[in-house]
Structure formats: C-alpha cells, structure tokens
Interface confidence: low
Amino acid sequence: GAPEGGQPYPVLRVAHSAPVGAQLATELSIAEGQEVLFGVFVTGKDGGPGVGPNSVVCAFPIDLLDTLIDEGVERCCESPVHPGLRRGLDFFQSPSFCPNPPGLEALSPNTSCRHFPLLVSSSFSRVDLFNGLLGPVQVTALYVTRLDNVTVAHMGTMDGRILQVELVRSLNYLLYVSNFSLGDSGQPVQRDVSRLGDHLLFASGDQVFQVPIQGPGCRHFLTCGRCLRAWHFMGCGWCGNMCGQQKECPGSWQQDHCPPKLTEFHPHSGPLRGSTRLTLCGSNFYLHPSGLVPEGTHQVTVGQSPCRPLPKDSSKLRPVPRKDFVEEFECELEPLGTQAVGPTNVSLTVTNMPPGKHFRVDGTSVLRGFSFMEPVLIAVQPLFGPRAGGTCLTLEGQSLSVGTSRAVLVNGTECLLARVSEGQLLCATPPGATVASVPLSLQVGGAQVPGSWTFQYREDPVVLSISPNCGYINSHITICGQHLTSAWHLVLSFHDGLRAVESRCERQLPEQQLCRLPEYVVRDPQGWVAGNLSARGDGAAGFTLPGFRFLPPPHPPSANLVPLKPEEHAIKFEYIGLGAVADCVGINVTVGGESCQHEFRGDMVVCPLPPSLQLGQDGAPLQVCVDGECHILGRVVRPGPDGVPQST
Amino acid sequence: EDWQCPRTPYAASRDFDVKYVVPSFSAGGLVQAMVTYEGDRNESAVFVAIRNRLHVLGPDLKSVQSLATGPAGDPGCQTCAACGPGPHGPPGDTDTKVLVLDPALPALVSCGSSLQGRCFLHDLEPQGTAVHLAAPACLFSAHHNRPDDCPDCVASPLGTRVTVVEQGQASYFYVASSLDAAVAASFSPRSVSIRRLKADASGFAPGFVALSVLPKHLVSYSIEYVHSFHTGAFVYFLTVQPASVTDDPSALHTRLARLSATEPELGDYRELVLDCRFAP
C-alpha cells in the first residue's frame, strides 16, 4: 500500500466495482470472481494533463482494501501505538491521537478505540492498468463486466465515444472490443451507467443509448485475421469481404478460415527469360512465426508461370513489432516459354493448411500489377579501359532494372554495379589479366541479354608529370606520361586537405593531355590555397603533384578608350590578379596586333608601345590573352592638342 | 537487393471511424439520473430523470410512462401532489439528485433538489415485460422534520449518492451528500448518514446516525461523493476532497469510506486514501 514512484493522478472521476475474469485475476494476484474496485483518475478537477495521459485506470481489490483498513485499525488501537499517530477525519470530528476517541484525553473504561471513525494512516497505491495508453482520451463513464474469462472496461468519453477495452496489465497496446461514437453531438458521456440484461445504458446530453455488452458489431475489424481473432463473445465471423455478426450476413458468415491477403509484392516486373525472386507481402500466409511452410500448401502463379516457394532465410527473419503485422513469402519465378510480355496478375492460393489457433488459412488472393519485360542492351561505353580496371562502364537500354538480379560480366568476371535504373546501368570494370579484347555481357535474372559486346583492356596509363604547379578555375594543366589514352578520361583532382574537387580531361595524345582545373573557390581574393593536384586514369595508379597553388582567377577591366599623352610611349592599365597568375599561364599583350614586352607592377600592367606601331585615326585595339583566352580591353588613341584624337 | 515488406501498422486492421447505430431514447432534456430494473418475471424497465420529469422506458427504450416531478409549486407537478395540499417550500425546478431502487419492495425512490431534498417512493407494477410506476408516496412527515433535524431531507442540491441495503425486513438508505454553509443551514442535510425507511412509507425514521463536516470547515472543505456501492458486509463511498483541512483546499485526493452494511451505525466508519499513479 505504500506510495510508489510515478506521476500521481489524485482525482477520481468515475468508478465501478465488479468481479474479475481469470486472466486479470491472475495479473492482480487474486482469485477469479473476486470483487475489484476500478477507478478512472485524472490529475486535477479540470482533468487537464501535465505530461502523461489524460486518464488512468487503477484497480483496487476489495479484499485488499478491507485488509488495509483492518490493519490500520490495528495500528491505531492495538498496543504499542506509534506515538503521534492521528485518528484523522478532523473535518468530521475533534482532532485526536490514537488510540483516543475524538476530542477526549484518554479512553474511559467503557469506550473502545474501535468504535469511532478513523482515517487509516497508510494509503493504497496502484499504477495505471493501461500503462498510459489511454493517452489523450478523457474518460467520463466506466462500467466493468466479466465476459467469459475476460474482464472488459466499458468507458464513455468526453467527446461522446464508447471504448470497450479488455482490462489486462501485461500488454503495451489496448485490446479493443470497440471504439465508436454514440452520435454526432459529441457531448460527454455522463458518469452513471446502468446494466439491463446484455446491454449497458449510457447517457450523453439528452439521450440514453443502449450498447450491447459484447460490442456494437464487428465491422470495425477490417481484416479476416483480425476478425476471427476477436473474442468469442463478440460473435464475429468473416462474410467474404467484411467482418460481421451472423445476423448481418447469414449466407456467407463463417468462423473457420481466412483467405490469404496479398497487399504488395516486389519487384513489380521481371525478365521474360531468367528468374526473379518475388517477395509477397500480406497477411494469413502461414500463421507460423518461424516462417516454415508445410509442403505443397502454397501455390503462387504469375500470369501462366509458377513461382516456386523458397524457404525463409532465417537471417532475415525479424520479430514482428507489437503494433505492426506483416507476413513475407518468397518464391522463385521462372517464366514458362508460353508466357507473354506485358502486365499480368500475381496469385497466391493456400490449401490443405493445418488449422491454426483461431482459424485455418484457405483460399486465393490476386493482385494486379506485375509485368514481364524483355531487357534490351542498346549501347555500352567506353569499350576500352586500363588493365587495372576501375573503368566506369555505362550500359544503356530498356528494362535493365527488371527483376531482382542482374550482372555485367567482363571476361566472365563481375563488373561491380554502382547504379541501376530502367534505362541505364553503371559499373566499374574488374582488373584484366592481359592487354586483350574480351567478351562483355549482361545477365538479368541469370539469363543473358541478347547482344555481342567486346571490351578492350589496354596498357595502364602512367602519369609522369603535371605542369604548371599553379593555376585557377578552368586554367590549363598539361599532363605528360605514357598510354594516357587507355583511359576513357583522365581525372584531375585538387584536394586542399578538407575536400576534393574534380574535372575530366578530354582525350588527346597518348603521351600528353591538356586538362582544365576543376571549379574551386578561393575565398580570399588576395590569397591562394595550396593542396595536392592528382591525375589518374580509371583504376590505374595516379600521380600527385604536392604544393599546387590554386589562385583566384584574374579579372579583366571593362573595355574603354585608352588615351595617351603626347609624351607617353607606354600604356598602363589595371588587371586585377593577372600578375599573380603570370607564372602559371601564358599571357600575351598586343596593341594593334603587335606584341609588347609587358611587365607587372602589382595589379598594374605596363606595356611599352612597339616602335613600329602606327596609331590611326581610330586608334589600335589593346588585347590581352590569358591562358589562350583573349579579351579586347579597349582602343589606344593619342588625342590632338584640342582633345580630338589624332594619328601619330 | 534485400527488399522487405513495409510493415502494416496494427491499427490498419481496425477502423474506429466505422459508424454504429445503437438504440437510443431522447429524453427531452439533459439526463440527470438513470437506473434500471430487472424483475423475476422477465419484466424490466429503465428510469430516466431529467429536470422536472421522470421517464419510464421499456426494455426496448420506448416510453411507457412519464411523470412530472416539478417545478415545485406548479399544479402540474405529480410527485409534489403526493405530499398533500399547501406550499411545502419555495417554488422552483426539480433537478433529480437521487434515483435508486429499493429492491425489497420493489420500488423506485427519487429525490430532487426542491422541497428540502425530500424523496418519493414509487412502487413498481409489472405489466407484461414492461413496468409502470404506482402513484408516488411522499417520504416526508412534516411533524418530524425541523430545519436543524430533518430525517426526511435526503438530497443536497450539490450532489448526493445513495446505496440501499436490506437489513432484516427494513431498508436502510446509506446517504452521502456534498455540503456547503448555505446548504447545511437549510434543513441540515448530513455528509454521511444511515436512514431507515419507515414501513408505512411516510418518510425516514428519526434519530438516524450521521457524520457532518464541522461548521468551521464548511466554507473551505467540500467533499464530492463520486460513487457508492455495496458488496459483502460493507457499503463504500468514494470521495474527492482536499488532502488536508489546514492546507491548500485545491490540493485534492481520493478516499474510500467504508461503512458496515450489517449494523446501522457509524462507529466503524473508516476512510482510506486511494493513490493512483502513472509510471512511464
């Protein structure tokens, strides 16, 4: 009876006492049929929640209540009495200490301690039978009945619903007989409930409702399995496609078997030639937790083709979570020669199953949506790569993702699949033994996809040098080496110690490739970032140039006229960042097509005019070429004395 | 590829939005009390009280009889008329506070908020599978009742719970009422009492045993009686009340009060605190 931990729910909202069924009696450690007081408690008068559920239900066995009261009387009235133990009930009587009667100093010989009202000093503590599962529900009415060996709480709620729930402590979900709305008014169900025969009477607003003790019906059970697992007293049976009581569908009502129910399957397509491992999902497949299927009981057909049941892989067996149910069934589909391409049905028939605890499985379930398809391989690229492997092959075609298995074989060795889609497969080639042309094939579902393809293993590319040792976004890099064209693309990557960026080189010569630096943002426009610049060809060994300087790109000024004073023989213009990249890329400055021996002073470029240069009436164009990319910055003109341009 | 079936939530096997239509009765006003009767000869009834009216329904929830229980002072009040002519108290609506069966007779007893909380006894008359109420008897003897001692003042307008117990040939009414200072001053109902129904159905025997909230606590200490029942040798009341007479009156807890069902006395009145918790 001592208080335990947990959140107190001190305010009783409704109560009812009733004898309990065998199962709950066992859980409460009392005898079946013993009277138990059930109370719905809330946290306060307003019933508003703190944390935790709105309503909780506690069970107090009457015999235990009486024992606690009798023990409390003993503590008050039998020697030795604990000093300071109060009789209590000070709102009814004068305060006093045990064993004295109210208001008196001490007992007189003709009065007994037991003959006066008493508040027992200890409380009777219990925890929520429903483990908080009533959640937001605010219970406003309660009546408890025993049905067979089951104890059922019939509860009315604040929003005008009736919940009929088995009272059981050991579960972490609610076992509902029913949960339904009394009407559309949504008014609270009132506290007092009465029983009349096999019905309970609940009041809500100005209405009285008569609810069968065994529940209002079975239509809220949506699946045959759930229907036939319902309590016997509910009288539920399966009526072909709904759960009902016998009077609702006397012609089709039965309680002995459920058909299997297919809800989903995977995959939704398979190859016309070759096998597919089909996974069927649903319920009422075998009713055995181990997933064992008795011989010859389950027949799966897809279109005209049989699907051979497979034993369940024990490593893949997963416990079905408390609030979920799903069954899986696997079979191997090998299409018949007569099977046609196109959409078809998946059908599961279960027969001759031994009866389960609640029913046996018997019947057929059909689901549309499987398609037989013919994979077609249209293109493969590249058809060559280094002996080291690692070439990313792209196979293009149709229906390449059908079924459950596919393999790209290069000279009989699997090419590791990186990506699979309906129209494209990506895989990385395995290493080759020698430089040679070898067969390349695609298998789907173990059957070869038509088409004859050859892959050429070439000598591994060898990178010997990378130059220059600096650059900026998209600036050119030269790679020198041997067999550089063996790879479909050389990949250039820059790594700053934190992240890497990559670009692909266009194929040119076996000994030399011209590449562009990848996109990389140098945050500080005045600075640069040092890192490693690497070049590699597919799976072959690469080459790394350490200490590569990645610079911000130079910014050309806007184009305009460049006027010269009479005494000037050199042009000065600003070109931010150009001086910094002068060691990394080729820079050429021309005026009127003639090259000038430019020099840098910070961000200023000084270009001495060539002696042979003739500036005409319109001047001459000033052009700067950086890494092969040319910009006309303006026209060089020499104004006359009155400011009008004139020729020299 | 290791594809797994998506799990189906357990809740997907049930639909609690399915509409069920169950038999119902429209009482014409907010239902204040309801009690059922099942006789030995397959006769049964449902009694439904609303303000100023008592409905008698058959087992099919069809109306069999309807009785006006108020307003007090209104010439149409059928129960009031059973107390004879003359004004019996201030006029006003009758809200039914007690509706119980006395299984010994058998009879229905109803007590309301008007006429000092007095009760009326309606003998049950079986008619086939249905039941009718005989003319009501007024359980009030004017010469026995005073404002400071009123054995026939049973119902409190603040709420009353009654359990009827047969002891020998007599019916004892175990009554628990919520009080405040104003209610206590008017024909002095008690918090807890045991009253014997007089054999001539003229009211309750005087000199009944009772406990009441002491006058000094009436303002701050209110007891709500939530439920009462009889099992074995005891009658039990369930209350919600302040945890202490001295501390914050809004700090409530729940108690069970136990009374002897075999001896109509209150010396062995016991209370026990019921503690219900949620342990996540």
């Epitope: 959640g135 937001p136 709305s181 | -």
Partner: antibody, heavy 116, light 108 residues
C-alpha cells in the same frame, strides 16, 4: 488537383485563443488523416497534431497537449486547430498536411504571432 | 521519443554535383522515414516516403536509401531549383512524429 487552403492566423496576446482552418479540395477528405505541423521563426519543422479520417484517432505533441484541439468537419472538407492558453513560443507558421503517415500534400501555411 | 540527427547542418555544392544528406535515428525506425524539401519562403514538399519511394511528381534525380537507424537522401546531379532546406521525418513510433533539424543546401 489536391489543394489545402489555410486561414485564421494573426496576432494574439499571450493567454489568448485562436482557431486555424484548412479547407481541402481535390480529394476525398474523409478518407485521409490530417496533420498540423508548425515552424517557429528561423527554426525547423515541428509536428503538432494528427486526426484520423473520421475523427476516431488523434495525437498531440507534448508541447501543445491540453491546450490545442484538432478537429475536422468532413461534410465541409475542413480541418481545424483550436488553440488556447497561447504562449510566445507558439509563434510560428502553421501548416496543415494530408495523410496518415506520408505527409504527401502541404498547405501554404498561416502565420500566428503571440505577443503582448 | 525518437531523435533524428541530420548531417551536415548546411552545405555548399556545385551545379551538376552529386549531393548526399544523412539522417541518423536514435533507434531502428524500420524504413518509416520521409524526406521533405522546403524552398526559401515556401511550404514544405515531400520528396521521398518509406525511405526510398519517390513521391508523385518528384524528379528522378532525387533518391533515398537506408535501413535500421541510418538513412540518406541523394541528389544525383544538383540543379539550381534544388536549393533549400531538407528535413527527414520519422513515423515509426508515434506520437510524436519527429523531424530532423534540417540540412541547408546552397549552390556554389
């Protein structure tokens, strides 16, 4: 075309009340559960409440339990969120979203500001 | 309650780049995971449900994968319109349904 049109936002004082609405069209409203999700300024998404198609099941986040009530009027294809005892931390954009677990369509959002 | 931890909290990526966002659950959530996109100033939009199923009208460059506690959203080739915040959402154990804290994706 599935559409969820929201209304009812605005400025409310702390301790005040407000009712948000979400009018649905383009699908069978009573067949789908509905959610409310909110987003406080410069914060992430926070789930608030859920109600099933026929109002038989509802869930609330602990932060709003006892203060907010989710309801729906199926004949009028409308979802509601009644908010009481509002606090400054309830300031957010409130979105309604369709379906039980797969929140496949979302409303445009309505802004609630709780401030004195 | 189940906690979803998203990484990174923000990232920059180039157009055309392959982008992957990670979502880790505090316990096994049995593939009951959605990915939701929210573009600046707009309402959220569901991209992926049940960990790897593409929602209606979502471009095929988006894909989801994972199992147990670890899930990822991949954009195979980033486009400008993919800029926004991406949230994961679990519905294995509820209430409550819980969202990840979000990953802000910006274009370099």
């Amino acid at each position: 075309e599935v559409k969820l049109e929201q209304s009812g936002g605005g400025l409310v004082q702390p301790g005040g009340s407000r009712k948000l609405s979400c009018a649905a069209s383009g699908f069978t409203f009573s067949s789908f559960g509905m959610h409310w999700v909110r987003q406080a300024p410069e914060k992430g998404l926070e789930w608030v409440a859920y109600i099933s198609g026929g109002s038989g099941t509802f869930y609330y986040a602990d932060t709003v339990k006892g203060r907010f009530t989710i309801s729906r009027d199926n004949p009028k294809n409308t979802l509601f969120l009644q908010m009481t005892s509002l606090r400054s931390e309830d300031t957010a954009i409130y979105y309604c979203a369709r379906s039980t677990t797969v929140l496949d369509y979302w409303g445009q959002g309505t802004t609630l500001t709780v401030s004195s | 309650d189940i906690v979803l931890t998203q990484t990174p909290s923000s990232m920059y990526a180039f157009l055309g780049e392959r982008v992957t966002i990670i979502c880790k659950a505090s316990q096994d959530i049995n593939n009951y995971l959605n990915w939701v996109q929210q573009k600046p100033g707009k309402a959220p939009k569901t991209l992926i449900y049940h960990a790897d199923r593409l929602a209606d009208g979502v471009p095929s460059r988006f894909s989801g994968s994972g199992s147990g506690q670890d899930y990822s959203l991949t954009i195979s080739s980033l486009e400008y319109e993919d800029m926004g915040i991406y949230y994961c959402l679990q519905y294995d154990d509820f209430p409550p349904f819980t969202f990840g804290s979000g990953t802000k994706l910006e274009i370099k």
